[in-house]
């Protein structure tokens, strides 16, 4: 029978080296055997390139295309082929469909003043446009209590978050993960980083740090502690903040 596309390709770029397109066929398809996605930059002298898709599910195909360091003016012509049959043709502008790379190396360290210091790495080199554009969302959740989770927006430059231990349940195991987006590019969210887990015990905190530390905040309740955070804490349900771009 004839080959048909059910959901046409939706593409995103990490705006540095790779664009990924995904589409759904109308029936289970061996993507790599039956289909090819050709792509060509709309620029004088650009050659035609071919991407061999892989299966994500029975009828879902995905193609990862190496691109040069993207610039705003870049527009790609995309053609989806089944042999000699052109199934779909369209264009794709990476700068208009950005999905940032996933932040890396999320770690948690004990810090002064009864705080945890969460740190991660910006996934872009300093010379890339997106390096200075990223803001982050950090999700902190109790491993044993699905109701106990917090979401923090990190809108300042440094990839760090200071978290008061007193805002978390003592003795509980917590996991954190982080994702990024680029507001000026109207990007979608990156994938979540792998989670990192730690035990929130802060009595006796001095032993955990290896030496006694005077705590000028001892008399403050958790509201007072929140005032000195470098992140704005937002508690919400994540499904309100899913972005779907096509």
């Amino acid at each position: 029978g004839s080959v048909k596309v059910l959901h046409e390709p939706s593409c995103f770029s990490d705006y540095i080296s790779t664009s990924v397109c995904q589409w759904k066929m109308d029936h289970p398809t061996n993507c790599s055997a039956e289909l090819r996605l050709s792509y060509q930059l709309d620029f004088m002298g650009s050659e035609n390139h071919t991407c061999v898709p892989e299966n994500r599910e029975d009828s879902v195909c995905v193609c990862s295309m190496p691109i040069d360091d993207a610039v705003e003016a870049d527009v790609y012509q995309l053609d989806l082929w089944a042999g000699q049959q052109l199934l779909w043709s369209g264009s794709f502008q990476p700068s208009k469909h950005v999905k940032p790379r996933t932040p890396g190396n999320l770690t948690v360290h004990p810090n002064i003043s009864h705080t945890w210091l969460l740190m991660w790495t910006n996934p872009y080199p300093t010379e890339n446009h997106l390096h200075s554009e990223l803001t982050y969302m950090v999700n902190v959740s109790n491993d044993n209590d699905p109701e106990d989770f917090k979401v923090y927006n990190v809108t300042y430059m440094g990839p760090t978050l200071r978290l008061a231990a007193s805002t978390l349940k003592s003795g509980a195991s917590y996991s954190a993960r982080v994702r990024a987006w680029a507001q000026t590019y109207n990007s979608t969210w990156s994938d979540w980083s792998p989670s990192t887990t730690w035990l929130n015990y802060y009595e006796p905190w001095e032993q955990h740090l290896g030496k006694p530390i005077p705590n000028p905040l001892l008399g403050l309740d958790s509201t007072g502690l929140n005032d000195i955070f470098e992140a704005q804490k937002i508690e919400w349900h994540e499904h309100h903040h899913h972005h779907h771009h096509h």
Partner: antibody
């Protein structure tokens, strides 16, 4: 040393045909787009045509579209310009030149960085 | 098509002085930051053209630093400092951004 040597220029009657060749050496020919530029006697430079490194993409000036065909043989490191239905206004020195690097996704541009010595095409009855 | 306009069409300069040639395009040649697809070429009498400047300001291999290119978007300038007798010839600007590639009319530089 990077070098381009054109040949094939001649005196031809209007409506006639001619094929110019340009043999390249000293660089990886298949990686670069190649261009033809012409110069009528006492006039300025006029771009004629360009072909990508693989030969998959070609471009032409309106004045020659449908009459001239650019091609290349990467195995022989040779660029060609097939000229049909020649007119008096096609009289010029024809230069081949090395253009942009096209093996990358976005071609890397260095201008027309090497030119041949040129070959004279005269169209006259 | 992008139209390239050079001024002046001829120029007479004494040795050691600075020569400036202007080139204006009918459309912006800026593709991305730092990438203006504008070249300068010199054709000496009886010779093939040779590349001087590409991408607006980058000197081609072997070109002395007396030659410099500047400008962005639609307005560009070639400056030749400490002009020498050997600099005589016709200077052309060319846009390499889109087909058809187009040249300026040429500027004839004469050394007094």
């Amino acid at each position: 040393e990077v070098q381009l040597v054109e040949s094939g220029g001649d005196l031809v009657k209007p409506g006639g045909s001619l094929r110019l060749s340009c043999v390249a050496s000293g660089f990886t020919f298949r990686d670069y787009a190649m261009t033809w530029v012409r110069q009528a006697p006492g006039k300025g430079l006029q771009w004629v045509s360009m072909i990508s490194g693989s030969g998959g993409k070609t471009y032409y000036a309106d004045a020659v579209k449908g009459r001239f065909t650019i091609s290349r043989d990467n195995a022989k490191n040779t660029l060609y310009l097939q000229m049909n239905s020649l007119r008096a206004e096609d009289t010029a020195v024809y230069y081949c030149a090395v253009d942009r690097l096209t093996k990358t996704i976005r071609p890397q541009y260095y201008g027309l960085w090497v030119w041949g010595q040129g070959t004279l095409v005269t169209v006259s009855s | 098509d992008i139209v390239m306009t050079q001024t002046p069409l001829s120029l007479s300069v004494s040795p050691g002085e600075t020569a400036s040639i202007s080139c204006r395009s009918s459309q912006s040649l800026l593709y991305s930051i730092g990438y203006n697809y504008l070249d300068w070429y010199l054709q000496k009498p009886g010779q093939s053209p040779q590349g001087l400047i590409y991408l607006g300001s980058k000197r081609a291999s072997g070109v002395p630093d007396r030659f410099s290119g500047s400008g962005s978007g639609t307005d560009f300038t070639l400056r030749i400092s400490r002009v020498e007798a050997n600099d005589t010839g016709v200077y052309y600007c060319m846009q390499g951004l889109q087909s058809p590639l187009t040249f300026g009319q040429g500027t004839k530089l004469e050394i007094k």
